[in-house]
Amino acid sequence: AADPLLGGQGPAKECEKDQFQCRNERCIPSVWRCDEDDDCLDHSDEDDCPKKTCADSDFTCDNGHCIHERWKCDGEEECPDGSDESEATCTLGTCHGNEFQCGDGTCVLAIKRCNQEQDCPDGSDEAGCLQVPPTFLGNRRRPRGLNECLHNNGGCSHICTDLKIGFECTCPAGFQLLDQKTCGDIDECKDPDACSQICVNYKGYFKCECYPGYEMDLLTKNCKAAAGKSPSLIFTNRHEVRRIDLVKRNYSRLIPMLKNVVALDMEVATNRIYWCDLSYRKIYSAYMDKASDPKEQEVLIDEQLHSPEGLAVDWVHKHIYWTDSGNKTISVATVDGGRRCTLFSRNLSEPRAIAVDPLQGFMYWSDWGNQAKIEKSGLNGVDRQTLVSDNIEWPNGITLDLLSQRLYWVDSKLHQLSSIDFSGGNRKMLISSTDFLSHPFGIAVFEDKVFWTDLENEAIFSANRLNGLEISILAENLNNPHDIVIFHELKQPRAADACKLSVQPNGGCEYLCLPAPQISSHSPKYTCACPDTMWLGPDMKRCYRDGNEDSKMGST
């Protein structure tokens, strides 16, 4: 059913003829009765409903409701009557010394273990028994030696299996042996890929949940965007910027008649698109719905640009960041292009893709030079560090999954798609394929999928971002697909602009206020920066024409 609060405003004494009156006097549409949603908020619309026959994969609540079997005994009451968490349902009873504990917790006489008859409801009393092959005498039982399981269940906390020599303790699903005898809970959530987004561990179970703005697809158990418009994928093919709706799959040209566009990014909240043209050596911006009109395309940066191959928009602090493989620099500017400064001009060989995390204050970039690597630093250019430097050759595209805190990249020489966490740990090679990753270039992540462009295949592919499986072609015959971004409000979560929280406008900075990386609770929220021709003064806020070169941001 829909939102219960929409079905009748507040308590009402009389309900309409096509409405159901709840015990608490709320009115809801009659069709919401017995739909397994607590629309009344007191469960009265779900009481006295005809008993349903639940699917084999479901648990039947005492009141007839059906819930997923795996939700039983997970510490949360999903049955309206709480029967999925009741003692009767959940207690794995401790069996007596002369009894055997079945996998489902019930007890049978230990003498019935391995008697070739199923005495436990789940048949676990016959699991792990040694069988004598049939002979001309018939299927005889083996001569009984000492069965240690008959006494105190062999000391096993759960399942005791008698062997020809000795015995063995085992555990029901969701548990593991801690000390050869005692079963303890398996923390399935230690596997970062156990769930699409959030993993909650319970005793003997685990449960997947979704972040706000997402809801679980009951079929695939993946988290899908619940809010807003359907996501679309925007990509450049050098001469155009195009858009594919990921759900409706309609295809449109956003910006025609371009010269040599490789890099682009978006600002979702303002509906703006940003792109770099390598031939014109300019960075542009436009509103998406007007971007096809050259008169609506604003030039943001048109000086001291050589080869802007990577571009990223900080949607929180309203900055753009770009790499320049010709100048061998990484720079930042306000989104209107009015104020800019170079953050890095040293130790860059072939900088290409760049991505930002404004929530934590970091940026990440790839460099496919001789010593190929992926690096990160604060959005203000401090705390530069290398994340990946081994088993990496031509890292073209990089992208961030802010929810799982992982960076994904494609390597067009190794034909690989890999991921790593934001600290540089838990590296995973998801796909290695000369077919699907012939010459990958751009990469993007959304929901449970990773998307990438491939220049040789002239296609856009997608795959499961957790395991690299379910590879499929989103679109083909695309002629030079380069950079890609996903356009959806959940890709750019709102956050506070630290520079605007200050009492002074622009954080008191004379020129640029840049967010600082949030490494600890003591980290500064921002630092000030100056244009390339000026230096930051001793007050760390104002800019001066002369000064000590060491204080210059661009020398980092």
């Epitope: 697809d217 359907s230 709706d245 759900v247 409706k248 799959r249 295809y251 679109a475």
Partner: antibody, heavy 122, light 106 residues
Framework: QVTLKESGPGILQPSQTLSLTCTFS??????????VGWVRQPSGKGLEWLAN???????FYNPSLKNRLTVSKDTSNNQAFLRITNGDTADTATYFC??????????????WGQGTSVTVSS | DTVLTQSPALAVSPGERVSISCRAS??????MHWYQQNPGQQSKLLIY???NLASGVPARFGGSGSGTDFTLTIDPVEADDTATYFC?????????FGGGTKLELK
């Protein structure tokens, strides 16, 4: 089981507004990725895509008829609607509604109604 | 609009293999679908996105092609395959249908 059924006026006069209803079951237009499309077929001729509406209320209209078409939905009653203003004899056709599946199905019409015949005649 | 061209009619004997072609006036990527239409019956989706068999459709039906040239194949043809077959693209706006190919059995 997915079923769709179209209903309409049958006969109407030129310049009148043609109102069509598609009543469906087996799916919901609240469900992510679902849409309902309208297609027509003049007798003995080919099919023409008129309009469609998606779960998120996004609408598409065929540009050749755009200013005459309005598509809408009533999700609680599992219905979709099409209005064509200023009816003309060229609008005489069988009108179909069909379910559209997005994502990997790619906008194909995977379930159709039987169609309802509309004649515009003075 | 993207024009889809189909040959109007084909005649084939039961048990044979038949190929029905659909040519697009511009690239439609892989977003080509095929339908079967019989008078008085609901149209039926056979193939979606060039080569994917729709649910409940016999494996005798197959699809292939890319870019602008696409083919629906029935092998072997059976008596109740007599129908009109339409192609449809959903890559370019507006979505368009081919004129249909009427399949008759000899």
């Amino acid at each position: 089981q997915v079923t769709l059924k179209e209903s309409g006026p049958g006969i109407l006069q030129p310049s009148q507004t043609l109102s069509l209803t598609c009543t469906f079951s087996g799916f919901s237009l609240n469900t992510y990725g679902m849409g309902v499309g309208w297609v027509r077929q003049p007798s003995g001729k080919g099919l023409e895509w008129l309009a469609n509406i998606w779960w998120d209320d996004d609408k598409f209209y065929n540009p050749s008829l755009k200013n005459r078409l309005t598509v809408s939905k009533d999700t609680s009653n599992n219905q979709a609607f099409l209005r064509i203003t200023n009816g003309d004899t060229a609008d005489t056709a069988t009108y179909f509604c069909a379910r559209i599946l997005g994502e990997d199905i790619g906008g194909a019409l995977d379930a159709w109604g039987q169609g309802t015949s509309v004649t515009v005649s003075s | 609009d993207t024009v889809l061209t189909q040959s109007p009619a084909l005649a084939v004997s039961p048990g044979e293999r038949v190929s029905i072609s659909c040519r697009a006036s511009e690239g439609v990527n892989s977003y080509m679908h095929w339908y079967q239409q019989n008078p008085g019956q609901q149209s039926k989706l056979l193939i979606y996105r060039t080569s994917n068999l729709a649910s409940g459709v016999p494996a005798r039906f197959g699809g292939s092609g890319s870019g602008t040239d696409f083919t629906l194949t029935i092998d072997p043809v059976e008596a109740d395959d007599t129908a009109t077959y339409f192609c449809q693209q959903s890559w370019n706006d507006p979505p368009t249908f081919g004129g249909g190919t009427k399949l008759e059995l000899k």
